[in-house]
Structure formats: structure tokens, C-alpha cells
């Protein structure tokens, strides 16, 4: 079966991109067609992660599927189209002037993408302007082989960047998470994401977010005051997608930021985060690269306590156990630490207020030749009720001016053996990191001290 629909406002079209499904337009399917699709959907969610080289965890530690392996598998699955949103591309060592064997996985991925194009599978890339990889030739190489590339001028449009990181493959499969299209994300940076297979409902909903970037990537694009109806979502916080993931009853939805890129029905990312925090009754565990209750990249900085207040309120008013694991690397802005200390200062076990903050330090070891690496880049949160996997760091810019996406998943325990729910898996990954020797309490982190592994 094939879904063919007429072109819609500015959206990617064949050969432009996917030839066999609705290009991000609203599902206006005939009942029978919808039924066929439902039968064909057998959604499966797999957590994926990158563990940097030379970062051993204790023997027997839980781990998710390696990200590089998952990406290569997704590309093997592709038959029609691959849509990628990524802040920047830097899949080869020479891109950043580095000669290191750990770039080989990224280079293999770039090769694989070129092979896809050779097999007449369409590739559409939305990337950011401004970008972090101004010397990278990856996108020129792919464009020369037929990939469509659009640089979305978020700097001009919203004074932010396109910081999203996700793939939609054949309108059925998804990757989303913290990893950019960067070889370091596969071997030198700690990342966390999710792959969802065989789930056209969710994939085509996420495709609508890709389409918002795509239409803004044309010359002289302007932000629409109201997004056309075909960008609207019917899957959100109030009406999540409901289905069986590997037999487990699951609800899920994608959120997006900034609000200016949230068409009707799309839950804003900040709202999703706050909703997950607000519904927690036992614990909130969050792992984010950066945590600033301020603006980040604008001058002068403004105070922005929205997430900070939500964590404090959960701990203080509801007795929720809060754990925050923040990254600490050579390129970490040290002005973050006073905010972390302030948050932790709220903790008062005697009054049943539990707030713990640690920093995660990836030892540089003999990888000092690789810039902007050896860091925990993950952006996720888990409660006893839900898993949130995101692409945004926790400061105002990422929610007000910069693009990002979040995935909120809740699975019903008891339908499967214990430990099978996504939120339980994510909790275990968090606790593995939290209890590892790389997670250091703030007391062990002198003010202004460089984030250098002292182990």
C-alpha cells in the first residue's frame, strides 16, 4: 500500500524526498487506509547510547544499544527516504583537523549515506545556521550525490540555532536524542537517545516538525504567524499516541521548541518537561549537559528560574527525590556551578526535602587531541511515571529561541516482566551513571576548578 497525496505548502516532495507517504501533512486518511496502517504498525522503542572510548563502567553494568550500531541498522532499513535534522555535521576527522582512529565510525556512516543516495534513496537534511562545523565538507559531499540540504537560518529567524537531532526513515522509523551528526558522538562523547521502529503514526508526527524546519530553509523564509493546518499535530500531551510497543501498553508524544515552531496541537518542549516534572510523586532524575536558570547566549543574561523552580517545588512541596546529573568537561562554563550549589542547598533530609546534584566527568585520558569531546552530552529525565528524552540543554534559550524536540513516553508496568518499561530502563541507566566513579558530588568540585578527572 502507498499513501500518495498532493504537494502541500512548501513541503518536501518527490524526488524532493519520500515518495511513498504523506509528506508531513495532516493524516486525512480514508478509514480503511488508516486501519491498514494501524495493522502494519508494530512499534518498538530501543534506548541507544554512546559510551566514549576508555570510559569503563563496572562489570555487569546495564547498557543500551550502541548508537553507532543503531544508526547503521536504521540506514540498512531505509528503502525510500531518510530525513535528518542536526545542529551540525562533522562525520570525518579532517572536518576538525584531527587524525584519530576513533573517527572511523563516523566516516563509515558518511559512506553509508552516500551509498543510500547511490541506491536512489532520498536524503533530506535540515541543519543550522549558525553552525558549529563551518569547515565540514560532509554536506557538500552528500549534496553532490543528490542529497537535499537546507540550512535553516535560526539565528536570523529566532536568534537561536537549530539544535534538534533526529531522523525520520521511510516515514516509519525514528531516531531522536542528544547526538549530532558528529563522529565524536559515536566514540568520544556520551550520548543518549531512542530509536523507534515500525511506528508510522509517531514517525509522521515527528516528520511534521522536520517540515517546519524544511520550509524555513528556503531563501528569505519568514516565520508564519500561524502555521498552515497541514503542520498541525493530533498527538500531544493531552492526546498522546497510544499503542503497544513490543506488547507493552504505551503512550507517547513529541514536543518541540521554540513555541514559534509549534503549530497547532504541538506541545511546547518546556510544557512537556514541566508536565513530566509536575506529575512525579516519587523521584525526578535528570541528566543534562548544562543547567542554567538564565539565558545562555544572549547579552545581557537574564534570570530564568522556570525549570529550577519546578525542581525545587517538586522536592519541597511533594517530597519528590530530585537528582540532577550535570556534565563537566573542558568546555563547561564554570558560571554554572553557583546555580547547582544553590539548588542543592535546598536539600534538607530532616524535612524530607531531597535534592542531590552531581557532575559527570569523562576522563580525557589520551584523547586530548580531540576538541569539544569527552563530555556527557545526554539530555534526559525520568520519573516513576514517564521517560523524557530530549535534545535541549536546560537554559532559557533552548526553549524560547532554539529548536529542539522531546519524546515523552509512559509504559504500563506489569504487562511485562519487571524492568521492561522504558522509564525503568532509563532509570537504571541514570543510576548506573549516578553511582559510577565518574559522577562527583559538588563538594568534591572546588569552585572554579577545571572539570578534569581526578580519579
Amino acid at each position: 500500500w502507498q499513501v500518495r497525496r498532493p504537494p502541500t505548502w512548501g513541503q518536501v516532495q518527490p524526488k524532493d524526498v519520500p515518495r511513498s507517504w504523506g509528506h508531513g501533512s495532516s493524516p486525512a486518511l480514508e478509514p480503511l487506509e488508516a486501519e491498514v496502517r494501524k495493522q502494519r504498525d508494530s512499534c518498538q522503542l530501543v534506548l541507544v547510547e554512546s559510551i566514549p572510548q576508555d570510559l569503563p563502567f563496572a562489570a555487569g553494568s546495564l547498557s543500551a544499544q550502541p548508537l553507532g550500531q543503531a544508526w547503521l541498522q536504521l540506514l540498512d532499513t531505509a528503502q525510500e527516504s531518510v530525513h535528518v535534522a542536526s545542529y551540525y555535521w562533522s562525520l570525518t576527522g579532517p572536518d576538525i583537523g584531527v587524525n584519530d582512529s576513533s573517527s572511523q565510525l563516523g566516516e563509515a556512516l558518511l559512506q553509508k549515506l552516500q551509498q543510500l543516495l547511490g541506491r536512489n534513496i532520498s536524503l533530506a537534511v535540515a541543519t543550522s545556521s549558525p553552525t558549529l562545523a563551518r569547515k565540514s565538507t560532509d554536506l557538500q559531499v552528500l549534496a553532490a550525490r543528490g542529497a537535499q540540504v537546507r540550512r535553516v537560518p535560526m539565528g536570523r529567524l529566532t536568534r537561536g540555532v537549530l539544535h534538534s537531532k533526529f531522523w525520520v526513515v521511510d516515514g516509519r522509523h525514528i531516531y531522536m536524542g542528544s547526538a549530532n551528526m558528529d563522529w565524536r558522538s559515536l566514540t568520544q562523547v556520551k550520548e543518549l537517545g531512542a530509536v523507534i521502529y515500525n511506528c508510522s503514526h509517531l514517525a509522521q508526527d515527528l516528520e511534521k516538525t522536520f517540515q517546519t524546519y524544511w520550509v524555513l530553509g528556503v531563501p528569505k523564509a519568514v516565520l508564519p504567524k500561524t502555521w498552515p493546518q497541514n503542520f498541525s499535530s493530533h498527538i500531544n500531551r493531552f492526546q498522546p499516541f497510544q499503542g503497544l510497543f513490543d506488547g507493552v501498553p504505551t503512550t507517547a508524544y513529541f514536543s518541540a521548541s521554540p513555541p514559534a515552531l509549534c503549530p497547532q496541537g504541538r506541545t511546547p518542549d518546556l510544557e512537556a518537561l514541566l508536565a513530566v516534572m509536575g506529575s512525579a510523586q516519587e523521584f525526578i532524575y535528570a541528566s543534562v549537559m548544562e543547567y542554567f536558570p538564565t539565558t545562555r547566549f544572549s547579552h545581557p543574561r537574564r534570570y530564568w528560574p522556570v525549570l529550577d523552580n519546578a525542581l525545587r517545588a517538586a522536592a519541597f512541596s511533594k517530597g519528590v527525590r530530585v537528582r540532577l546529573l550535570v556534565s563537566c568537561g573542558l568546555n563547561t562554563d564554570p558560571t554554572m556551578f553557583p546555580y547547582l550549589r544553590s539548588l542543592q542547598a535546598l536539600s534538607n533530609p530532616a524535612a524530607n526535602v531531597s535534592v542531590d546534584v552531581k557532575v559527570f566527568i569523562v576522563p580525557v585520558g589520551n584523547h586530548s587531541n580531540i576538541p569539544f569531546s569527552r563530555v556527557n552530552h545526554s539530555k534526559f529525565m525520568v520519573t516513576e511515571k514517564a521517560a523524557y528524552i530530549g535534545t535541549s540543554n536546560w537554559s532559557e534559550d533552548y526553549f524560547s529561541s532554539t529548536t529542539g524536540v522531546g519524546l515523552v513516553v509512559t509504559q504500563s508496568p506489569g504487562a511485562q516482566p519487571a524492568g521492561a518499561t522504558v522509564q525503568e530502563q532509563l532509570r537504571q541507566l541514570f543510576e548506573r551513571d549516578w553511582s559510577s566513579r565518574y559522577a562527583v558530588g559538588l563538594d568534591g568540585q572546588a569552585p572554579g576548578q577545571d572539570c578534569v578527572w581526578q580519579g
Epitope: 545542529y87 543550522s128 545556521s129 549558525p130 553552525t131 558549529l132 563551518r134 569547515k135 540550512r151 537560518p153 539565528g155 536570523r156 540555532v161 539544535h163 549537559m289 548544562e290 547566549f297 556534565s327 568537561g329 573542558l330 568546555n331 563547561t332 562554563d333 564554570p334 586530548s368 576538541p371 569539544f372 563530555v375 552530552h377 540543554n393 577545571d450
Partner: antibody, heavy 124, light 107 residues
């Protein structure tokens, strides 16, 4: 407050080496920035010469590549410029500056702190 | 290397005037452009980064705009303390390159 101050001889003979020091106070040169030398020729033209990164790596202007070296002494929080085989064309005011900030995810880089500059004349 | 050209090497204007200084790159620099002010005593200060973002402490009468190869710095209400030379600088690629400067004087 971050401050940068250049020092070194004001007069250098042709064919000799020019050596300058930039002393940094209020910030560690092992953190978050490219520590840069920029010179301004008579008539105002500015030329980026090169940097030493927070991690000790270098990048130089190809027009100077065979003559320039930028090093540092982290214990003194200083970085240095050495320019070999100078000619009268190297007469300029030499400024040190920092470029960055090189925080994760930040695409906006600029020279936000400059030294006052030191004038070097190349003459026999 | 990317060449940066400021065609006007000097200009004079009256207090309160709106002044625009332009800068052209030899190729598209995708908004990776900064503006600096050099006072007569030689001190250099960052004014604007990434084409249009005002640096901390810079008065709001300064603004920047442009795209592709053409950029400009505007001072909306000229004050005596704005007497200086203004430089554009690209950070799209290495080596970093600067415009030749525009010297601004008061009539």
C-alpha cells in the same frame, strides 16, 4: 576583571626575532578561549597572526606560518609571540586578545578582551 | 583568505545623526561578522557579534544588520564618545580577517 597586557622590546633589528609577552590576569589561559595575537600596521590595517588555544594547540596565519610561534607558560598565566626574520614590514602595534568563548554548543566567537597594544619598530 | 572591505575610510557626521558604516566580504560569510570600536587612544572594544547581537554593556544606539556578503553597523543617535575607528571582522573561517576600518569624526 579580565586584563591582558603586552610587553617586549620596542625596537628590533631587521633579520632578528621579535619576542613579546602577553600577561593575563583575572582568567586562566588554560580555560575556554583562544589566546590570540593581532597586529595593526601604520595606516590601521589589522592582521590576525594566530592563537594558542586553552588546550595548548596552535593555529597560525598562513602568511606568517614559517616565521611565527606562539607558546605559553601556564604557571605564569602568560603567552608569547615569537616572529623570526623580521623586516621593516613587521613594524606595527602588537595586540594580544582572547577569542571565544569556546563553550559547548556556542557558535558565536569574538575578540571580547584586548590588550592596550605595544608598538614595535623594526629598524637598523 | 576572505577579504573584508570597508569602502569608506573616514566619515564625519553631526551629533544626533544616524550613521551607517558598511562592510563587504569577498564571499558569503553567513552572518559570522563582528564589529569593533577602536578609540583614539588605541583601546579596542567589541560592539556587535554575529551581525546583529549587542555585546554586554554596549549602548542600544548601536545596531548591526546584513547577510551574505554585505553588512552594516548603524549608530542611531551619534554622541561625542562615538568618535572612533570601526572595524568589521569575519569569523566564518581561519584566518580571521578584518576590514580596513572607518574613522568616524564629528562635524
Amino acid at each position: 576583571d579580565v586584563q591582558l597586557q603586552e610587553s617586549g622590546p620596542g625596537l628590533v633589528k631587521p633579520s632578528q626575532s621579535l619576542s613579546l609577552t602577553c600577561s593575563v590576569t583575572g582568567y586562566s589561559i588554560t580555560s575556554h578561549y583562544y589566546w590570540t595575537w593581532i597586529r595593526q600596521f601604520p595606516g590601521n590595517k589589522l592582521e590576525w597572526m594566530g592563537y594558542i588555544s586553552y588546550d595548548g594547540s596552535n593555529n597560525y596565519n598562513p602568511s606568517l606560518k614559517n616565521r611565527i610561534s606562539i607558546t605559553r607558560d601556564t604557571s605564569k598565566n602568560q603567552f608569547f609571540l615569537k616572529l623570526n626574520s623580521v623586516t621593516t614590514e613587521d613594524t606595527a602595534t602588537y595586540n594580544c586578545a582572547r577569542e571565544g568563548p569556546l563553550y559547548y554548543g556556542n557558535p558565536y566567537w569574538y575578540f571580547d578582551v584586548w590588550g592596550a597594544g605595544t608598538t614595535v619598530t623594526v629598524s637598523s | 583568505d576572505i577579504q573584508m572591505t570597508q569602502t569608506t575610510s573616514s566619515l564625519s557626521a553631526s551629533l544626533g545623526d544616524r550613521v551607517t558604516i558598511s562592510c563587504r566580504a569577498s564571499q558569503d560569510i553567513d552572518n559570522y561578522l563582528n564589529w569593533y570600536q577602536q578609540k583614539p587612544d588605541g583601546t579596542v572594544k567589541l560592539l556587535i557579534y554575529y551581525t546583529s547581537r549587542l555585546h554586554s554593556g554596549v549602548p542600544s544606539r548601536f545596531s548591526g544588520s546584513g547577510s551574505g556578503t554585505d553588512y552594516s553597523l548603524t549608530i542611531s543617535n551619534l554622541e561625542q564618545e562615538d568618535v572612533a575607528t570601526y572595524f568589521c571582522q569575519q569569523f566564518n573561517t581561519l584566518p580571521r580577517t578584518f576590514g580596513g576600518g572607518t574613522k568616524l569624526e564629528i562635524k
